[in-house]
């Protein structure tokens, strides 16, 4: 009685259970009454990452420097190449097919999380007591200067974009 289902790492063809090709190899010929499945290794710059019956290997991803990409991890016969972005850039998607410049946080906003190769800068508004007077992809919100600790008084209040201005205390007559 021909099988209707096959074991793991096998596939059904012509009423026979044939072994799948292992990762890194492609199918040349299905198994027969006389032979096991015939598989061949993937070529240079090709891969297959699963047990398979593919007759063609997949091409490794190309990390195009014109799109700001560089190789993070070189592909093997069993794995695809992993791309990441050049310094100062990040991927536009999980697949990392292109890059964009890291966003800068405007004055009044500070960096909550510095960008990585795969995620953009996360900015946050500077809360009361903090300020940022630059557009930056690295600078956090800085605390206002404490005039008291310098034996000075606040002459001009700070904002989310400016520090306080300290001055000498008025002398009592």
């Amino acid at each position: 009685e021909p099988p209707t289902a096959c074991r793991e790492k096998q596939y059904l063809i012509n009423s026979q259970c044939c072994s799948l090709c292992q990762p890194g190899q492609k199918l040349v010929s299905d198994c027969t009454e006389f032979t096991e499945t015939e598989c061949l290794p993937c070529g240079e710059s090709e891969f297959l990452d699963t047990w398979n019956r593919e007759t063609h290997c997949h091409q490794h991803k190309y990390c195009d420097p014109n799109l700001g990409l560089r190789v993070q991890q070189k592909g093997t016969s069993e794995t695809d190449t992993i791309c990441t972005c050049e310094e100062g850039w990040h991927c536009t998607s999980e697949a990392c097919e292109s890059c964009v410049l890291h966003r800068s946080c405007s004055p009044g906003f500070g960096v909550k999380q510095i960008a990585t190769g795969v995620s953009d800068t996360i900015c946050e508004p500077c809360p009361v007591g903090f300020f940022s007077n630059v557009s930056s992809a690295f600078e956090k919100c800085h605390p206002w200067t404490s005039c008291e600790t310098k034996d000075l008084v606040v002459q001009q209040a700070g904002t989310n974009k400016t520090d306080v201005v300290c001055g000498p205390q008025d002398r009592l007559r």
Epitope: S29, E33, F34, T35, E36, E38
Partner: antibody, heavy 113, light 112 residues
Framework: QVQLQESGPGLVKPSQTLSLTCTVS????????VYWVRQPPGKGLEWIGM???????DYNPSLKSRLTISKDTSKSQVSLKLSSLTAADTAVYYC???????WGQGTLVTVSS | ELQLTQSPLSLPVTLGQPASISCRSS???????????LHWYLQRPGQSPRLLIY???NRFSGVPDRFSGSGSGTDFTLKISRVEAEDVGVYYC?????????FGGGTKLEIK
């Protein structure tokens, strides 16, 4: 439908080289393997060697030093070359696909001066 | 080189009677993937061999169910439950587990 047909000289002189061609139709040699078998008159079957779909070959060690099997996928042909012939190489030569029951009709090769 | 030894060499049988042919291998025919590539052919006079049984016990398409194969490891048997006139010829066992593939010496079945 699947067909295999052997062709070559019926008579070859001792010490010469035998060249046989197996022309196939109904399938691609890049996806299927083909092997050669011979049968001396009134005797049993002897496996000669095979050409795998991927292009590699396996030979019978008793013939390996005299044997070359190759293929031209675009022409759908598998070739057998057997050198330094003797009378013991007189046989019907068959090419066979390695699945199902697809045999050529066979070609008789006589080695004689 | 792996040897396949068939017995008997000659098998005279009465029509309608059963017949049995043995094939013994000099080493195990189980492949690394667990398949046993032992096959049976019938060669009628003046014809090319015809596949009857593949992988020990699988009847090839169109082969009558009076033919059956059994065995494992190194000992294998072809049985014909009721011999018919068209069954006359030489029966060969064959293995394709190990290179070189080999054939048994043949068993000639004839009608008594």
């Amino acid at each position: 439908q699947v067909q295999l047909q052997e062709s070559g000289p019926g008579l070859v002189k001792p010490s010469q080289t035998l060249s046989l061609t197996c022309t196939v139709s109904g399938f691609s040699l890049s996806r299927y393997s083909v092997y050669w078998v011979r049968q001396p008159p009134g005797k049993g079957l002897e496996w000669i060697g095979m050409m795998w779909g991927g292009g590699s070959t396996d030979y019978n060690p008793s013939l390996k030093s005299r044997l070359t099997i190759s293929k031209d996928t675009s022409k759908s042909q598998v070739s057998l070359k057997l050198s330094s012939l003797t009378a013991a190489d007189t046989a019907v030569y068959y090419c066979v696909r390695t699945d199902g029951d697809y045999w050529g009709q066979g070609t008789l090769v006589t080695v004689s001066s | 080189e792996l040897q396949l030894t068939q017995s008997p060499l000659s098998l005279p049988v009465t029509l309608g009677q059963p017949a049995s042919i043995s094939c013994r291998s000099s080493q195990s025919l189980a492949s690394s993937q667990g398949n046993t590539y032992l096959h049976w052919y019938l060669q009628r006079p003046g014809q090319s061999p015809r596949l009857l049984i593949y992988k020990v016990s699988n009847r090839f398409s169109g082969v009558p169910d009076r033919f059956s194969g059994s065995g494992s490891g190194t000992d294998f048997t072809l049985k014909i439950s009721r011999v018919e006139a068209e069954d006359v010829g030489v029966y060969y066992c064959s293995q394709s587990t190990h290179v070189p593939w080999t054939f048994g010496g043949g068993t000639k079945l004839e009608i008594k």
